[in-house]
């Protein structure tokens, strides 16, 4: 019987440094390797027929135990398939690799308005884009913790409001007087220093009444 | 045939650093990732990290990460594990061992004793 | 990280008999471990790979079997030069070894 194998199906390393993923196979006479990559929508041939092909040739070496990367980038993180055959047989198999490139988050940016109306919807967006993996976001109100659950600390019961550490995304339905303050977001990944926006005040004000 | 030589036996007191070399014979050394593994007296095997011998590239265990350091030179076929800050938990012997997938060839092993 | 539970931590038995020792795994492993046999003062000499895959060269009363979490390695007519200790290796995700199972003769 034929097994395609790594003992490391998920690595992680910082960016610009070296690195391995390993495949190793028995059970094949004349093993014929390819190694593909994917990343969303894209898929990439990085070897073909036990060679490394020619838009990788000049930072990826094949070796009979895997591939190996003089130096990877944060385009490099994704999914990496060894997939071995028979050469002119039938016999194949095949093992996924998981690469993540270390890149510690950049300086968030945020979106905050001046001034919302008091009973309106009111959405702060916090975003980074260097951050691999993505980073999770934490927002601050005047210099305090936002848990995700306003009902869950005293200091926020009196807010109404979604937080997605995910999107980074803080949506106020209703916004009330007490929300107004001073909003800033921290973003981290696990990796490197975690990074603070700037910080920006938002006013909660009384909807205009016409006479 | 496949050889992995480690170098002999060290004596270090505590907070001092140890250089172990392995030098292999009978193979492609960059073909293959070089572990290193513990065993203290009496006790049983304990990954520690390896060195990827064409680019450098290494991985360690948590619990000696930052104390490990594992190194290449291919141009003599040889690894190093240097183990720093020794306390007298250290004392064991190190092997080195070439990964397949699992480990197939050993080195001899190299007793260090860390002692004041 | 996957943990290995081996088990008996050491045995006694007499030549000719069966013996058997466990690796428990702490999630499934896929078969991919290997079993190496230690004795005093020397490296680990690998004996199986891949469950039940025996090395070149090892006798065949050596042999291994198991799937998903729990795997055996037996010995089907203990020898004196079986005398050592044995551990197990999952490498399905990383490396972790068993704690080893010292084998005296009775």
């Known amino acids: 019987s034929v097994t395609v194998h790594s003992s490391e199906p998920e690595v992680r390393i910082p960016e610009n440094n070296p690195v391995k993923l390993s495949c190793a196979y028995s059970g094949f006479s004349s093993p014929r390797v390819e190694w593909k990559f994917d990343q969303g929508d894209t898929t990439r041939l990085v070897c073909y027929n036990n060679k490394i092909t020619a838009s990788y040739e000049d930072r990826v070496t094949f070796l009979p135990t895997g591939i190996t990367f003089k130096s990877v980038t944060r385009e490099d993180t994704g999914t990496y398939t060894c997939m071995v055959s028979e050469e002119g047989g039938n016999s194949y198999g095949e093992v996924k690799v998981k690469l993540i490139v270390l890149v510690p988050p950049s300086k968030p940016t945020v979106n905050i308005p001046s001034s919302a109306t008091i009973g309106n919807r009111a959405v702060l967006t916090c975003s980074e884009q260097d951050g691999s993996p993505p980073s999770e976001y934490t927002w601050f109100k005047d210099g305090i913790v936002m848990p995700t659950n306003p009902k869950s600390t005293r200091a926020f019961s009196n807010s109404s409001y979604v937080l997605n550490p995910t999107t980074g995304e803080l949506v106020f339905d209703p916004l009330s007087a007490s929300d107004t303050g001073e909003y800033s977001c921290e973003a981290r990944n696990g990796y490197g220093t975690p990074m603070t926006s700037n910080a920006v005040r938002m006013e909660a004000v009384e909807r205009n009444v016409g006479v | 045939e496949v050889q992995l030589v480690q170098s002999g036996a060290e004596v270090k007191k505590p907070g001092a650093t140890v250089k172990i070399s392995c030098k292999v014979s009978?193979?492609?050394?960059?073909?293959?990732?070089m572990h290193w593994v513990q065993q203290a007296p009496g006790k049983g095997l304990e990954w520690m990290g390896y060195?990827?011998?064409?680019?450098?590239?290494?991985r360690y265990a948590e619990k000696f990460q930052g104390r490990v350091t594992i190194t290449a030179d291919t141009s003599t076929d040889t690894a190093y594990m240097e183990l720093s800050s020794l306390r007298s938990e250290d004392t064991a012997v190190y092997y080195c061992?070439?990964?397949?997938?699992?480990?197939?060839?050993w080195g001899q092993g190299t007793l260090v004793t860390v002692s004041s | 990280d996957i943990q290995m539970t081996q088990s008996p931590s050491s045995l006694s038995a007499s030549v000719g008999d069966r013996v058997t020792i466990t690796c428990q795994a702490s999630?499934?492993?896929?078969?991919?471990i290997a079993w190496y046999q230690q004795k005093p003062g020397k490296a680990p000499k690998l004996l199986i790979h891949?469950?039940?895959t025996l090395e070149t060269g090892v006798p065949s009363r050596f042999s291994g079997s198991g799937s998903g979490t729990d795997y055996t390695f037996t010995i089907s007519s203990l020898q004196p030069e079986d005398i050592a200790t044995y551990y197990c290796?999952?490498?399905?995700?990383?490396?972790?070894f068993g704690q080893g199972t010292k084998v005296e003769i009775k």
């Open positions: 060195i990827d011998p064409y680019n450098g590239g290494t």
């Open positions: 999630q499934d492993i896929n078969n991919y």
């Open positions: 290796l999952q490498y399905d995700n990383l490396w972790t």
């Open positions: 891949y469950t039940s």
């Open positions: 009978g193979y492609s050394f960059t073909d293959y990732s």
């Open positions: 061992a070439r990964q397949t997938d699992y480990f197939d060839y």
